[in-house]
């Protein structure tokens, strides 16, 4: 199940708080380190934060990405960092703040054809293999050459964003990666709160699309905290 | 378009086996999950299993663990479900279904009856 | 055993707006912000009608919507239309078993 698999050897030997829980050595299976975990400090409040391990960018928060906190540091070190605002230099898209994408290293405003969320090739190096598969180091599949010379429509398996076709993003889904669609106008979205533990993120979704945020929906004001829903709302 | 179309089930006894076959058309098969639900009569839909694209994943539901068996041939585009020691509450209509966002495209279902 | 429990028939009139109810626990659809509808007709194929709580597939009417709070969710259909009479099925995923699972069903009546 999900839940040995969380428990498994790929993440056991993480930084705290993912390594909290035993492992099962005999594990046939293990997923890649953080992308599920049962519980955590993920969502610490800002007052009491601390830095969440990492090995992608698509486990950070919409305002975060994935890198080492120190130039030239430990790569093998990583931990969800706040996200670049425009004109402040950059690497890859997922540096910049939502709304912005990296050009010649520079975070600048996106257009229709720059979404957020995508994912460096040098990621995959780190799993070795589809990650959605959640056979961690089993194997080396060969889903990349075999598979992505076309893009990959909604419902199809994908590594990253741009595996996906325009308008698509890559998303978790039960126990995959797959091409979802960009969030328009109204459509119920994941806020990424500082704030106890959220559970299994099992049901990623893409970020808003152009000109919109994700913000909490206002006939739920009165809702509990739980269970409140944030949609994609005009800025 | 997208077509799922299933095959053989039939009357069988109980403690027998069966293999029911699905074949795919219409998207590439190879780049999506795929999973069986069943049906019972005058039921409601009870997932069965799912496979992952490339076949190392395979989840199942409790009822059907150990003795069910979910298999893919992305060459063929076809999925299978063998099914061994069957039971009488093994009885239903047995559709397979893309599992894209969820179960997005289904086939038209083929019935399995456990019967002595 | 059935995860999810569904009101087992509603029934409206053409014109009518009707809601059908989902109910989970904390372990399953309370757990996540997602649910999945199913529409039914008698002897066919089910077919996707809302994901991800509130997402219409291309090709379903804008007259059918979903929402949650809490351990609830809820499919709505406005401008009830006789061709809505059918069996409604929602659909989540039980963190303790690591499945998906479905409602009991339920049955609306177009009068």
């Known amino acids: 199940t999900l839940n040995s698999v969380l428990n498994s050897n790929a993440i056991k030997n993480l930084p705290p708080p993912l390594g909290g829980a035993a492992g099962h050595p005999g594990s046939a299976v293990s997923a890649a380190p953080g992308i599920l975990y049962p519980g955590g400090n993920k969502y610490q409040t800002i007052d009491n934060y601390q830095p969440y391990p990492c090995a992608e960018d698509e486990e950070c928060g919409t305002d975060e990405y994935c890198a080492s906190p120190t130039r030239g540091g430990d790569a093998g070190v990583q931990i969800c960092l706040a996200c670049r605002k425009r004109r402040k230099r950059c690497m890859r898209h997922a540096m910049c703040c939502p709304g912005n994408y990296c050009k010649n290293g520079i975070c600048v405003s996106s257009d229709q054809n720059h979404f957020r969320g995508e994912i460096e090739e040098t990621i995959t190096e780190s799993f070795g293999n589809d990650h959605s598969t959640l056979d961690g180091y089993s194997r080396r599949t060969t889903l990349s050459s075999k598979m992505y010379h076309t893009k990959g429509q909604e419902g199809s398996v994908c590594l990253r964003s741009s595996d996906c076709a325009s308008g698509l993003c890559c998303a978790r889904h039960f126990w995959s990666k797959i091409c979802k669609p960009v969030l328009k106008e109204g459509q119920v979205c994941t806020k990424h709160r500082r704030k106890g533990s959220h559970g299994l993120e099992i049901f990623q979704r893409c970020y808003c699309g152009e000109g919109l945020s994700c913000r909490i929906q206002k006939d739920h004001h009165q809702a509990s905290n739980s269970s409140r829903l944030h949609t994609c709302q005009r800025h | 378009q997208v077509q799922l179309v299933e095959s053989g089930g039939g009357l069988v006894q109980p403690g027998g086996s069966l293999r029911l076959s699905c074949a795919a058309s219409g998207f590439t098969f190879s780049s999506y999950w795929m999973s069986w639900v069943r049906q019972a009569p005058g039921k409601g839909l009870e997932w069965v299993s799912v496979i992952s694209s490339d076949s190392s994943s395979t989840y199942y539901a409790d009822s059907v663990k150990g003795r069910f068996t979910i298999s893919r041939d992305n060459s063929k585009n076809t999925l299978y479900l063998q099914m061994n020691s069957l039971r009488a509450e093994d009885t239903a209509v047995y559709y397979c279904?893309?599992?894209?966002?969820?179960?997005?495209?289904w086939g038209q279902g083929t019935l399995v009856t456990v019967s002595s | 055993d059935i995860a999810l429990t569904q009101p087992a028939s509603v029934s409206g009139s053409p014109g009518q707006s009707i809601t059908i109810s989902c109910t989970g626990t904390s372990s399953d659809l309370g757990g996540y912000n997602y649910v999945s509808w199913y529409q039914q007709h008698p002897g066919k194929a089910p077919k996707l009608m809302i994901y991800?709580?509130?997402n219409r597939p291309s090709g379903v009417s804008n007259r059918f919507s979903g929402s949650k709070s809490g351990n609830t969710a809820s499919l709505t259909i406005s401008g009830l239309q006789a061709e809505d009479e059918a069996d409604y099925y929602c659909q989540s995923y039980d963190s303790p078993t690591d499945s998906v699972v479905f409602g009991g069903g339920t049955k609306l009546t177009v009068l």
């Open positions: 991800d709580v509130n």
């Open positions: 279904a893309r599992h894209g966002i969820d179960f997005d495209h």
